[in-house]
């Protein structure tokens, strides 16, 4: 809303409000290795970190979300920590038919915000 | 991706896992009573409950924040659950010159996925 | 511009009941909630409820509560005004309004016959 | 319930003269936000009731401006600066600052 200004300094100290982390993962830590052929290794960034009130609320449903959270936080959850735009990756795989290559646009975050 | 099978029946019991939920607020709840002037109540839909593995996965980076946060459970959060889609609701509110009509399209949240 | 289209003239029995519908053409809803009111002949106009978005629980009038039900289902944009347990007093024309909240009752449909008798 | 008062109940009107109706409620329509929730609606003969007046005095899209609001707390009216033979029909007050939402009985407007 026009009355609730998203904050972008964290309060809880450095590195501990939502942002972006890159985690190393092999084939094996995904399951993939049975039909990915390449890369052997991602770096999948993810968003991760806590959610404080009006930090990088996502839209006006997150500020809201906010707000209830302080009122009835049994009963309303904070906002979470999750992407809020991604980066492609081309991954080479087995086919039926042999090997493909396909870009994939939703599996390493390029950026978070809290919703 | 094509070797990840999201699911929709909830382990974890009725009512348990990531679900859109209705919650009632007023203007004063929302701090909104100095500006909208109606509706004076809203139904908050919001998106409420649990993220089990690949439980109403978002998409392919959902499924591997599910895959590494049961490997890592300390460094990889689990998926958490937040709006897939909005309903949009118009506000009739006040403005420096008097009082207008908006249609906010975040604010009310329609459906819920995993993220 | 949005328009509200209801649906045609109905007779009934008394005791049954009778369900009007309300489409939004050219457009859906939109965010805005829908109220219904009847006029009676020759008689001013009376709110029996409304519903706001997400369209989810509605709000009655005490006079009409438990006799009416009203619903929306967005992904056809129409509202429905459903009536049970029909008495001759509720012989009326049923109108469906777009309003924000109760307020401002923008858009109008253009009312539908209910004729209730034995 | 707010029980809505208007008066006259018949208002004979001439061509290009002014006429204004009033409209009472039995209690304070002013909410804690500075607003009136009263708004007016025109019903044609045949048709549909149409906004004219909501919150008490802001005109709705496409009203012209010789329709004006005024008034707070319980006594309103609705003015009309020169009628035209289009404005004839049944005007009713609406109170919207609490359910059950209340109209007023109308007042018909005719051509003398």
């Known amino acids: 809303s026009a009355h609730a200004h998203p904050r972008d300094s964290c309060p809880l100290g450095p590195g501990r409000c939502c942002h972006l982390e890159t985690v190393q993962a092999t084939l094996e830590d995904l399951g993939w290795s049975d039909w990915v052929l390449s890369p052997r290794q991602l770096q999948l960034s993810m968003c991760v970190g806590e959610c404080p009130h009006l930090y990088r609320s996502a839209n006006t449903h997150a500020q809201i979300k906010a707000r209830l959270h302080g009122l009835q936080p049994d009963k309303v959850p904070a906002p979470c920590c999750v992407p809020s735009s991604y980066t492609p990756v081309v991954l080479m795989h087995r086919t039926d038919s042999g090997v493909s290559l396909q870009t994939y646009d939703d599996l390493v975050a390029r950026g978070c915000h809290c919703a | 991706s094509a070797h990840a099978h999201p699911r929709d029946s909830c382990p974890l019991g009725p009512g348990r896992c990531c679900h859109l939920e209705t919650v009632q607020a007023t203007l004063e709840d929302l701090g909104w009573s100095d500006w909208v002037l109606s509706p004076r109540q809203l139904q908050l839909s919001m998106c409420v409950g649990e993220c089990p593995h690949l439980y109403r996965s978002a998409n392919t980076h959902a499924q591997i924040k599910a895959r590494l946060h049961g490997l890592q459970p300390d460094k990889v959060p689990a998926p958490c659950c937040v709006p897939s889609s909005y309903t949009p609701v118009v506000l009739m509110h006040r403005t420096d010159s008097g009082v207008s009509l908006q249609t906010y399209d975040d604010l009310v949240a329609r459906g819920c996925h995993c993220a | 511009q949005v328009q509200l289209v209801q649906s045609g003239a109905e007779v009934k029995k008394p005791g049954s009941s009778v369900k009007v519908s309300c489409k939004a053409s050219?457009?859906?809803?939109?965010?805005?909630?829908i109220s219904w009111a009847r006029q009676a002949p020759g008689q001013g106009l009376e709110w029996m409820g409304g519903?706001?978005?997400?369209?989810?629980?509605?709000n009655y009038a005490q006079k009409f509560q438990g006799r009416v039900t009203i619903t929306a289902d967005e992904s056809t944009s129409t509202a429905y005004m459903e009536l049970s347990s029909l008495r001759s007093e509720d012989t009326a024309v049923y109108y469906c309004?777009?309003?924000?909240?109760?307020?401002?009752?923008?858009?109008w449909g253009q009312g539908t016959m209910v004729t209730v008798s034995s | 319930d707010i029980v809505m008062t208007q008066s006259p109940l018949s208002l004979p009107v001439t061509p290009g003269e002014p006429a204004s109706i009033s409209c009472r409620s039995s209690q304070s329509l002013l909410h804690s936000n500075g607003y009136n929730y009263l708004d007016w609606y025109l019903q044609k003969p045949g048709q549909s009731p149409q906004l004219l007046i909501y919150l008490g005095s802001n005109r709705a899209s496409g009203v012209p401006d010789r329709f004006s609001g005024s008034g707070s707390g319980t006594d309103f009216t609705l003015k009309i600066s020169r009628v035209e033979a289009e404005d004839v029909g049944v005007y009713y007050c609406?109170?919207?600052?609490?359910?059950?939402?209340?109209f007023g009985g109308g007042t018909k407007v005719e051509i003398k």
């Open positions: 609406m109170q919207a600052l609490q359910t059950p939402i209340t």
């Open positions: 309004a777009r309003g924000v909240g109760e307020l401002h009752l923008d858009v």
């Open positions: 519903i706001i978005p997400p369209y989810a629980t509605a």
């Open positions: 050219g457009g859906t809803f939109q965010g805005y909630a």
